[in-house]
């Protein structure tokens, strides 16, 4: 806490400019008054304050403010956004993306802080629903920010938001969070032509099921083995040997070098080694010639 | 007068871990913030991270994100800097130095301390 | 990041040569700029921040100028004590990026 003194004469603050980075912090809890800081925040980021003469800025909009800042202070913090804690901002109501915008670009380039995480769940809270605009600001600063959503949060995205989702977006989501974002995608992209469909769909087809493969196989998607590598096992499992040939075109080649890691381990176990050997890569593993293959599974679903 | 002295460097082996050390005096350590910047020998400085003066922003350059740590302990006076994952491209003078604000230069320097991480 | 480039790389010089070395930074960082010596086996030492403003005990001979994404470090009058390595950095952001130096050499 800061000691409540008089200002000295002649150094009370007519407005927040450079000479201000001269005054201890005392000088500036007496003489800086929090209403003018309020209303010209947007100059505290051209000036080169120190960490304590930051907090004491803080402290002096704390005052002004305890319930929590308003929107037109919380847009202009600059870099003093990031003195917030996480309990500072859950004060907030920040319901402009103009706002969001300024505060994610204090922080851009770096990866996601306390701060920001907490910002933006507020704000999505806020709104509702993660919305295309909102969506699309936030993988722009944050690729990875979809991601790091729970398949809770990510059944509140409106299919129409899955255009704003780019590629690398989706680097980081495990298979549970692409089972939820599949469908919205399906949905989203229904009305595009099969490459055009396809070019859209394929970062998202680690939440595909079989049949939606199968369709795809009769399609001359030529899938490329790295999207091939991201498919559910589950899902590829009952794929034909001519189906997985059909879906990867002249990328099949590929699965040899894959032969050992699954899906294509798994898969490989499923088919019968003829077939296999008909793909010509030397592919081993497959159920030998003469056996016969029960499927358990159908058998437990029938008793 | 301002003092920073950096300690913890040594012989390491690539993939190991090492924990370096700053200790300051002279100012207030809690106000300001530190940095960690190295040079590889006959290279360039480079900036490796900063931490704001009461430990709540950290940041770091691409080339160690993921596997340094930088931390202080403000009782103590002292900057730390964890390292994991050596790698060879590691090998450097690293240099404790003082910054009194997120836009204040470097203004105070240790005088280094040698990491070599070679099998 | 921000990329700091600087030029050029060497520069020979005698003394009592007036020395220019420039900085160009990858966007624009205002005057959020500084420069510093180095000396070999020795830390860096600050000579000039905010792009033109003088550290304390630095001698006059040494200037800077420029903001946004240009900048020059300027020596008026070179000693012998001048000779040694000379480093900008940026500050505008809280990754803080170097330039890779230039080296002033006795001619």
């Known amino acids: 806490e800061v000691e409540k003194t008089a200002c000295p004469s002649g150094k009370k603050a007519r407005e927040i400019d450079e000479s201000l980075i001269f005054y201890k912090k005392w000088e500036l809890e007496a003489c800086v008054d929090a209403a003018l800081l309020a209303t010209q925040m947007d100059r505290v980021n051209a000036i080169p304050f120190t960490y304590e003469q930051l907090d004491v800025l803080k402290h002096k909009l704390d005052e002004l403010y305890p319930q929590g800042y308003p929107e037109s202070v919380i847009q202009h913090l600059g870099y003093l956004f990031l003195k917030m804690s996480p309990e500072d901002i859950r004060k907030w109501n920040v319901t402009s993306l103009e706002t969001l915008k300024a505060l994610l670009e204090v922080n851009k380039g770096h990866e996601m802080s306390p701060q920001v995480a907490t910002l933006i769940d507020r704000f999505v809270k806020g709104r509702g629903q993660l919305d295309k605009d909102t969506l699309d600001t936030l993988t722009a600063f944050y690729p990875g920010y979809l991601c790091s959503l729970s398949p809770e949060e990510l059944s509140s995205v409106p299919p129409s938001s899955i255009w704003a989702v780019r590629p690398q977006d989706l680097d980081t989501c495990d298979p549970r969070q692409l089972d939820v974002l599949y469908p919205k995608a399906r949905l989203a992209f229904q009305n595009m032509n099969g490459s055009e469909y396809f070019v859209k769909i394929q970062s998202f087809l680690g939440g595909a099921p079989t049949e939606d493969l199968k369709a795809l196989s009769q399609q001359n998607v030529s899938m490329d083995l790295a999207t091939f590598m991201k498919l559910r096992t589950d899902a590829v499992l009952p794929l034909t040997v001519a189906e997985v040939q059909k879906l990867l075109g002249p990328h099949v080649e590929g699965l040899k070098a894959e032969e050992r890691h699954r899906p294509v381990r798994d898969w490989i176990l499923r088919q019968r080694q003829d077939d296999l050997d008909t793909l010509g890569l030397g592919l081993q593993g497959g159920i030998p010639n003469g056996y016969l293959v029960l499927d358990l599974s159908m058998q437990e679903a029938l008793s | 007068q301002v003092q920073l002295v950096e300690s913890g460097g040594g012989v390491v082996q690539p993939g190991r871990s090492l924990r370096l050390s700053c200790a300051a005096s002279?100012?207030?350590?809690?106000?300001?913030?530190m940095n960690w910047v190295r040079q590889a020998p006959g290279k360039g400085l480079e900036w490796v991270a900063v931490?704001?003066?009461?430990?709540?922003?950290?940041y770091y350059a691409d080339s160690v994100k993921g596997r340094f740590t930088i931390s202080r302990d403000n009782s103590k006076n002292t900057l730390y800097l964890q390292m994991n994952s050596l790698r060879a491209e590691d090998t450097a003078v690293y240099y404790c130095?003082?910054?009194?604000?997120?836009?204040?230069?470097?203004?105070?320097w240790g005088q280094g301390t040698l990491v070599t991480v070679s099998s | 990041d921000i990329q700091m480039t600087q030029s050029p790389s060497t520069l020979s010089a005698s003394v009592g040569d007036r020395v220019t070395i420039t900085c160009r930074a990858s966007q624009s960082i205002s005057r959020w700029l500084a420069w510093y010596q180095q000396k070999p086996g020795k830390a860096p030492k600050l000579l000039i921040y905010?792009?033109?403003s003088l550290e304390s005990g630095v001698p006059s001979r040494f200037s800077g100028s420029g903001s946004g994404t240009e900048f020059t470090l300027t020596i008026s009058n070179l000693q012998p004590d001048d000779f040694a390595t000379f480093y900008c950095?940026?500050?505008?952001?809280?990754?803080?990026?170097f330039g890779q130096g230039t080296k002033v050499e006795i001619k």
């Open positions: 130095a003082r910054d009194r604000g997120p836009l204040w230069p470097l203004d105070y």
């Open positions: 002279g100012f207030t350590f809690s106000s300001d913030g």
């Open positions: 905010k792009a033109s």
């Open positions: 931490i704001w003066n009461d430990g709540s922003n950290k």
């Open positions: 950095q940026q500050y505008n952001s809280y990754s803080r990026t």
